[in-house]
């Protein structure tokens, strides 16, 4: 008799999830010599332990604490790049500007990027059929709690000038409900962080508006200023040229505004 299984509103665990996490861990530790000591089997065991046999609407930050311990890593606190709704460009940027880090450039972020996972209460099974949706089912699900935990810790670690890349093509350039708006902004430490500098990325080729004057950017400035952190904003009118100039800063065309 097939066992009754809870139907959630979101997609199920990414296929081959255990193998993917383990393979990513091995790859990461091979690419980053300073992480060669990491035991990837222990990392997977800690990851699995955070959600297996637990109700997928009852996950806490504490569940991920064993994984956090194993993911200990040096991140230069003044080289942190946050992003919201523009992940691909942020990652392209840090692939070129190798001394800057997004969360997904760390071991923990790299392991979980673009994956979905959940278990079931009282069984050791991974649920490949469905997982809770943040809005329709519950917010304390394994994926949401993981990203809230690591995003909070990443923001707490930041210092000096913190950069954030924002998508100027969206109706809400700054969205209070995004991970950046709801978690990271509120966990920057005013005693450590001097300035938050927003880079607003333009989408249209002929878009010459000053998106730093957008009402949602003004809202971000207000939130940040109230936290005693300075705020600055730059328009990136040509993201393609911006990346090109990061690669080749001595190019003569890179002195003009991008």
């Amino acid at each position: 008799v097939p066992r009754w299984r809870q139907q959630w509103s979101g997609p199920g665990t990414t296929k081959r999830f255990p193998e993917t996490v383990l393979a990513r861990c091995v790859k990461y530790t091979e690419i980053h010599p300073e992480m060669r000591h990491v035991d990837c089997q222990s990392v997977w065991d800690a990851f699995k332990g955070a959600f297996i046999s637990k109700h997928p609407c009852n996950i806490t930050e504490e569940d991920y604490q064993p994984l956090m311990k194993l993911g200990t890593q040096t991140v230069p606190c003044n080289k942190i790049l946050l992003w919201s709704r523009i992940k691909d460009l942020a990652h392209q940027f840090t692939q070129v500007q190798r001394d800057m880090f997004t969360l997904e450039d760390t071991l923990l972020g790299y392991l979980a990027d673009d994956l979905t996972w959940c278990g079931e209460f009282n069984t050791s099974k991974i649920n490949y059929q469905s997982c809770p949706d943040w809005r329709k089912d519950c917010s304390n699900n394994p994926v949401s709690v993981f990203w809230k935990t690591v995003s909070r810790r990443f923001a707490e670690a930041a210092c000096d000038v913190v950069h954030v890349m924002l998508n100027g093509s969206r109706s809400k350039i700054f969205d209070k409900n995004s991970t950046f708006g709801s978690v990271e902004v509120h966990n920057l430490q005013p005693e450590k962080v001097q300035t938050l500098e927003a880079w607003v990325i333009h989408g249209g080729r002929e878009d010459s508006r000053d998106l730093c004057q957008d009402p949602t950017i003004k809202e971000l400035e207000s939130i940040i200023s109230k936290r005693n952190i300075q705020f600055s904003c730059k328009n990136i009118y040509r993201p393609d040229k911006f990346l090109q100039c990061v690669k080749n800063p001595e190019d003569s065309s890179c002195t003009s505004e991008i």
């Epitope: 040096t74 230069p76 810790r153």
Partner: nanobody, 117 residues
Framework: EVQVLESGGGLVQPGGSLRLSCAAA????????MSWVRQAPGKGLEWVST????????DYADSVEGRFTISRDNSKNTLYLQMNSLRAEDTAVYYC??????????RGQGTLVTVSS
């Protein structure tokens, strides 16, 4: 700007004890969780222990649980690590860092602990 200075390391025989200190400046010490991390020769960074800002909550790596004790004196802006029953595998440079991890940017020079007979 966060500044830390670690001290108290040295050469000790297996089974011996050491007490590390970390003097902090440039921030409101009591507002921040503090951690000890270590780096053994040729190895990566390993988290050792964390203590909450008020000192009430502590957490330890399995490898040091029951042997090491983290504490702090907020009136002196100082973090401590009492290390007992030291083993060869505890040999490392020990750093103190603000925050609870897992992402650390340690600002001090660290203090070298060598456990050898």
């Amino acid at each position: 700007e966060v500044q830390v200075l670690e001290s108290g390391g040295g050469l000790v025989q297996p089974g011996g004890s050491l007490r590390l200190s970390c003097a902090a400046a440039g921030f409101t010490f009591s507002n921040f969780a503090m951690s000890w991390v270590r780096q053994a020769p040729g190895k990566g960074l390993e988290w050792v222990s964390t203590i909450s800002g008020g000192g009430g909550g502590t957490d330890y790596a399995d490898s040091v649980e029951g042997r090491f004790t983290i504490s702090r004196d907020n009136s002196k802006n100082t973090l401590y690590l009492q290390m007992n029953s030291l083993r060869a595998e505890d040999t490392a440079v020990y750093y103190c860092a603000d925050g609870r991890g897992p992402f650390f940017d340690y600002r001090g020079q660290g203090t070298l602990v060598t456990v050898s007979s």
